[in-house]
Interface confidence: medium
């Protein structure tokens, strides 16, 4: 249905509050360096304009596309050239090229300092003084740090954030109430950001087909009672929603997401028995609840896969006349029967099945050729199972910090050219897989671990793409989305790497280290570990363990000393010399 005014249509559909929030998020994701006040002003002006168009659809400029209206607004920002350099050149272009240009300038690593919460009393005062501004600042700070954050989900988290303050600002001990709740929300927000970045990368780098395949597998696991037609319908709609959000079309994205939630709730009977509770909630909570809903039980009478995909004499006809539909059915049937498999594994199996049919359907006797195809899946299934088992055993032995360090060593040896901050960030996140997944029952471990690893490795790929330094990282990132993790797992030590020159400055520490929170202290130590490996890539695990032990003791000793700075400047060089000698 065509609307006279697109902006009025979205304003009416979303309501003023959500509309304003989404516009603020959109601008903050495009112009990440602009101060909050500027974005509030822009969002207010756009919302006022939308309101006027809703009242009179044939008003001046109301018929313009959202990209045109938003782009024109962004291009009025006076400091565009100073703050963003060549991004200002986007403003010379016409739509749709101008929007594509803005998207290309989104910075996945803007380098803003981590958000540090002020004192609880100050926070509560700000919250009570102007709730709308307080939540707007939250949207802005998250959006500018995460330019691909899933906007409707960010509105949901802002609502959660509001709930935390509404509750905790009434509490006797505000700090004790706020601390754990804000931290739990922070973890969820970071994971949500990484998951959406993975979805956007799937769409942008590998296309709709890859994203749809991923979604078919995931939703078939979650809704095994739904038939393929129903799964396909939801996947098609979901693809549109994520394409819009990844493309910066946040108003359309949020509106379509609400429509999808409405459709799912109206068709619960043919999707899942688990949707009822979600469907009684208001729109933001409803969509979030549906996205996180627990898996439905498997239907009890599922026939053998072999009947349809191996034993049937028409397999090649079915495949050749409608390849994607046939493979989609295979993926659906396999996924609904295997909720314990990771999505990545299911996609590898579908790929293997496709390759087998491509080969066999060209032979004189296809049925004999593909007769054992399902048995050939075994090594593909065994590989992630063994990987999870081995790594969870290591995690249980070393704990999270020790496991992160083991991964740090592993990944620095695989790709020593990658920047130290990136190696530290990614290895720390990879290490969290242990905490997140290893305590789960066997039936959930692989799915939890491998799909989480895919999301974290995507972060490595995104950061590496900005400044490519390692051909092997580029290769693993770009060749196949579903084989990224096995590709990284399979990388051996990079023997071509020329060790980095020793730089004493890298290993110089100061008393400020002592007052850092534990997590930041760990980052400092892990940074030193990576630098050490870049200097001495042939160091053995034993040697590294000794040096890191000495380093830990040195930090502990100096932080307990009367004259901390003096201790660091005197003992530091001795430690470095001892480390160099130990690593010869």
């Amino acid at each position: 249905e065509a609307y006279k005014s697109e902006i009025a249509h979205r304003y009416n559909d979303l309501g003023e509050e959500h509309f304003r929030g989404l516009v603020l998020v959109a601008f903050s994701q495009y112009l990440q360096q602009c101060p909050f006040e500027d974005h509030v002003k822009l969002a207010k002006e756009v919302t006022e304009f939308a309101k006027a168009c809703a009242a009179e659809e044939s008003g001046a400029n109301c018929d313009k596309s959202l990209h045109t209206l938003f782009g024109d607004k962004l291009c009025t920002v006076a400091s565009l050239r100073d703050k963003y350099g060549d991004m200002a050149d986007c403003c010379e272009k016409q739509e749709p090229d101008r929007n594509e240009c803005f998207l290309a300038h989104k910075d996945d690593n803007p380098g803003f300092p981590p958000l540090v919460a002020p004192e609880p009393d100050a926070l509560c005062a700000a919250f009570q003084d102007n709730e709308q501004l307080f939540l707007g600042k939250y949207l802005y700070e998250i959006a500018r740090r995460h330019p691909y954050f899933y906007a409707p989900e960010l509105l949901y988290y802002a609502q959660q954030y509001k709930g935390v303050f509404a509750e905790c600002c009434q509490a006797a001990d505000k700090a004790a109430c706020l601390g754990p709740k804000i931290e739990a929300l922070r973890e969820k927000v970071l994971l949500s950001s990484a998951k959406e970045r993975f979805k956007c990368a799937s769409l942008q780098k590998f296309g709709d087909r890859a994203f749809k395949a991923w979604s078919v597998a995931r939703l078939s696991q979650r809704f095994p009672k739904a038939d393929f037609a129903e799964i396909s319908k939801v996947v098609t709609d979901l693809t549109k929603v994520h394409k819009e959000c990844c493309h910066g079309d946040l108003l359309e994205c949020a509106d379509d997401r609400a429509d999808l939630a409405k459709y799912m709730c109206e068709n619960q009977d043919s999707i899942s028995t688990k949707l009822k509770e979600c469907c009684d909630k208001p729109v933001l909570e409803k969509s979030q609840c549906l996205a996180e809903v627990e898996r439905d039980e498997l239907p009890g009478d599922l026939p053998s896969l072999a009947a349809d995909f191996v034993e049937d004499k028409e397999v090649c006809k079915n495949y050749q006349e409608a390849k994607d539909v046939f493979l989609g059915t295979f993926l659906y049937e396999y996924a609904r029967r295997h909720p314990e498999y990771s999505v990545s594994l299911l996609l590898r199996l579908a790929k293997e099945y496709e390759a087998t049919l491509e080969k066999c359907c060209a032979t004189d006797d296809p049925p004999t050729c593909y007769a054992k195809v399902l048995d050939e899946f075994k090594p593909l299934v065994d590989e992630p199972q063994n990987l999870v088992k081995t790594n969870c055993e290591l995690f249980e032995k070393l704990g999270e910090y020790g496991f992160q360090n083991a991964l740090l060593v592993r990944y620095t040896k695989k790709a020593p050219q990658v920047s130290t901050p990136t190696l530290v960030e990614v290895s720390r996140k990879l290490g969290k897989v242990g905490t997140k997944c290893c305590k789960k029952p066997e039936s959930e471990r692989m799915s939890c671990a491998e799909d989480f690893l895919s999301v974290v490795l995507n972060r490595l790929c995104v950061l590496h793409e900005k400044t490519p330094v390692s051909e092997r990282v580029t290769k693993c990132c770009s060749e196949s989305l579903v084989n990224r993790r096995p590709c990284f797992s399979g990388l051996e030590v990079d023997e071509t790497y020329v060790p980095k020159e020793f730089n004493a400055e890298t290993f110089t520490f100061h008393a400020d280290l002592c007052t850092l929170p534990e997590a930041e202290k760990q980052v400092k130590k892990q940074t030193a570990l990576v630098e050490l490996l870049k200097h001495k890539p042939k160091a053995t695990d034993e040697q590294l363990k000794t040096v890191m032990g000495d380093f830990g003791a040195f930090v502990e000793k100096c932080c307990a000393a009367e004259n901390k700075e003096g201790c660091f400047s005197e003992e530091g060089p001795k430690l470095v010399a001892a480390a160099q000698a130990a690593l010869v």
Epitope: A226, D227, F228, A229, E230, S232, P303, A307, D308, F309, D312, K313, E314, V315, K317, N318, E321, A322, V325, F326, G328, T329, Y332
Partner: nanobody, 126 residues
Framework: EVQLLESGGGLVQPGGSLRLSCAAS????????VAWFRQAPGKGREFVAG????????YYADSVKGRFTISRDNSKNTLYLQMNSLRPEDTAVYYC???????????????????WGQGTLVTVSS
């Protein structure tokens, strides 16, 4: 729940024609694999013709190829079987079956079709 209702059967002379219909409710007929089977007295249910959902891939048993045509009208949510050059050995009760969730016919095995109509009798005799 899917309901299927066949009609169009009857008595016809050898060489004659009939058109069977199968009206579906509870699921769109273009979203699911549908097929015609037949069962002669004292015999098992035998595949006659099928059509894939979403993609119009058609399938025929060797014994009916060139004589029977399967088709569907999505707007009426109805499946058809046009039967020409009928022979006495075509005498049977004709059933339509569907497999929701399967966009393609991937089987000629009756057991794999969970939903059936009640059947319509076709008698070919002079």
């Amino acid at each position: 729940e899917v309901q299927l209702l066949e009609s169009g059967g009857g008595l016809v002379q050898p060489g004659g024609s009939l058109r069977l219909s199968c009206a579906a409710s509870g699921r769109y007929i273009d979203e699911t694999a549908v097929a015609w089977f037949r069962q002669a007295p004292g015999k098992g249910r035998e595949f006659v013709a099928g059509i894939g959902g979403g993609v119009d891939i058609t399938y025929y048993a060797d014994s009916v190829k060139g004589r029977f045509t399967i088709s569907r009208d999505n707007s009426k949510n109805t499946l058809y079987l046009q039967m020409n050059s009928l022979r006495p050995e075509d005498t049977a009760v004709y059933y339509c079956g569907t497999r929701p969730g399967r966009p393609l016919i991937t089987s000629k095995v009756a057991d794999l079709y969970p939903y059936w109509g009640q059947g319509t009798l076709v008698t070919v005799s002079s």
